[in-house]
């Protein structure tokens, strides 16, 4: 028997269902009875979800996995992953045996898309060009690390003193933190840039200081 | 016939570990899972886990996950139980169990466990 | 995880009775199991799938029963069923049994 699944990794968003497929050619006369089909873990061999000799033995992971029944005498052997999280993260074996067996894994990765950066401003009164100010840029519940960049008003890359710090909840989603302190000029945008690197998803966010009182774009 | 013949009786200290065997003979010992299950004395069972010899895969119950280690020889068709850090509760009989869809349908004649400072 | 409270948990009867066992589960199963065990032996598969006799088990024992309610009967008591009986299910993880019934006699 002969196991294949999909070579690139399955990308799923939190809390959407993910089906990580393996399929396997049955020969003629091939009945559910003679099948074993073991999902694991591939790091630790750790079971996911099985069926032996014509019966669904049911998720061992967090009641959250199902096969497709009806399609497994066809050698569909997917699974199905149901409100996926980031801890869920990783690779899994699909384990196939009928006479003989055979085995490949694929690839999980779940992504969450970053919410649209807040921008605030200290000081937020009483600006001067020439004075300093720190912007913070912040945005939320994305997974993974993200990638923060700032531009200026003419899209020149602002890279010194930037400090970014991500931290993660407890449902493993990392809230972004970036701080840019600069020396305000006369008029001056500052936009930050919060990248998804797995979903090539960009969240914008800018702030405009035109003299007094400071503006803050509208939403696209 | 299918056979699962275990490792004979042992006593032990606390804070020892424990390996027993299990042996198996008249069937294709790497397409079954096979369990394990204590049994205190006067007390009822209880599932410790199980693994797949074909590919390695096991589950434990949560309970026993930090002291129970399953594993298998396929070249010897003998799966093992190693316990560690074992206390006076340890002390039971611990059986292995093959299982065919979803019954444990043949067991070892058990491996009686004392843990005694 | 899913529990099974067998009752009673002791049964007085004489050979040539009938006997009940129930197995009742906290959460519905598809399937029940049930197993015998006399002192100083393992277990023995009886039933699967509920209703199904192992090989070799006599027609006097039989199971029934769906959802949260299972039972074991046994038509007529012979001197060699005098064990201990347990229900066990494998709907979801970790597999669990019931905390046996005591079948002795009279």
């Known amino acids: 028997v002969e196991v294949q699944v999909s070579e690139d990794p399955v990308v799923a968003l939190v809390d959407t269902d993910a089906t990580l497929r393996c399929s396997f050619s049955p020969e003629p006369g091939f009945s559910l009875a003679q099948l074993n089909l073991i999902w694991q873990l591939t790091d630790t061999k750790q079971l996911v979800h099985s069926f032996t000799e014509g019966r669904d033995q049911g998720s061992a992971y967090s009641n959250r996995t199902a096969l497709f029944p009806d399609l497994l005498v066809q050698g569909n052997a997917s699974l199905r992953l149901q409100r996926v999280r980031v801890t869920d993260e990783g690779s899994y074996t699909c384990f196939v045996s009928i006479q003989d067996f055979d085995s490949a894994a694929v690839s999980l990765q779940v992504a969450a898309p970053y919410s649209k950066p807040s921008m605030t401003l200290e000081p937020n009164k009483d600006l001067r060009p020439g004075n300093m100010v720190t912007i913070t840029c912040s945005s939320y519940q994305g997974y993974p690390e993200a990638e923060v960049f700032w531009k200026d008003g003419q899209g020149v890359p602002l890279t010194g003193n930037v400090t970014t710090s991500q931290m993660a909840n407890e449902r493993g989603l990392f809230d972004v933190h970036s701080v840019l302190r600069v020396v305000l000029g006369a008029n001056g945008t500052y936009s930050c840039l919060v990248r998804n690197p797995v979903l090539q998803q960009d969240a914008h966010g800018s702030v405009t200081i035109t003299g007094q009182p400071l503006t803050f774009p509208p939403e696209a | 016939q299918v056979q699962l013949v275990q490792s004979g009786a042992e006593v032990k200290k606390p804070g020892e570990s424990l390996k027993i065997s299990c042996k198996a003979s008249g069937y294709n010992f790497n397409n079954y899972w096979m369990h394990w299950v204590r049994q205190r004395p006067g007390k009822g069972l209880e599932w410790i886990g199980m693994?797949?010899?074909?590919?390695?895969?096991?589950n434990y119950n949560e309970r026993f996950k930090r002291k129970a280690t399953l594993t298998v020889d396929k070249s010897i068709s003998t799966a093992y139980l190693q316990w560690s850090s074992l206390k006076a509760e340890d002390t039971a009989m611990y059986y292995c169990?093959?299982?065919?869809?979803?019954?444990?349908?043949?067991w070892g004649q058990g491996t009686l466990v004392t843990v005694s400072s | 995880q899913i529990v099974l409270t067998q009752s009673p948990s002791t049964l007085s009867a004489s050979v040539g009775d009938r006997v009940t066992i129930t197995c009742s589960a906290s959460?519905?199963?598809?399937?029940m199991y049930w197993y015998q065990q006399k002192p100083g032996k393992a277990p023995k598969l009886l039933i699967y799938?509920?209703?199904n006799l192992a090989s070799g088990v006599p027609i006097r024992f039989s199971g029934s029963g769906s959802g949260t309610s299972y039972t074991l009967t046994i038509s007529s008591l012979q001197p060699d069923d005098f064990a201990t009986y347990y229900c066990?299910?494998?709907?979801?993880?970790?597999?669990?049994f019931g905390q046996g019934t005591k079948l002795e006699i009279k």
């Open positions: 693994i797949h010899p074909n590919s390695g895969t096991f």
């Open positions: 066990q299910q494998w709907s979801s993880y970790p597999l669990t």
């Open positions: 799938d509920t209703s």
């Open positions: 959460s519905s199963v598809s399937y």
């Open positions: 169990a093959k299982s065919t869809a979803l019954a444990t349908d043949y």
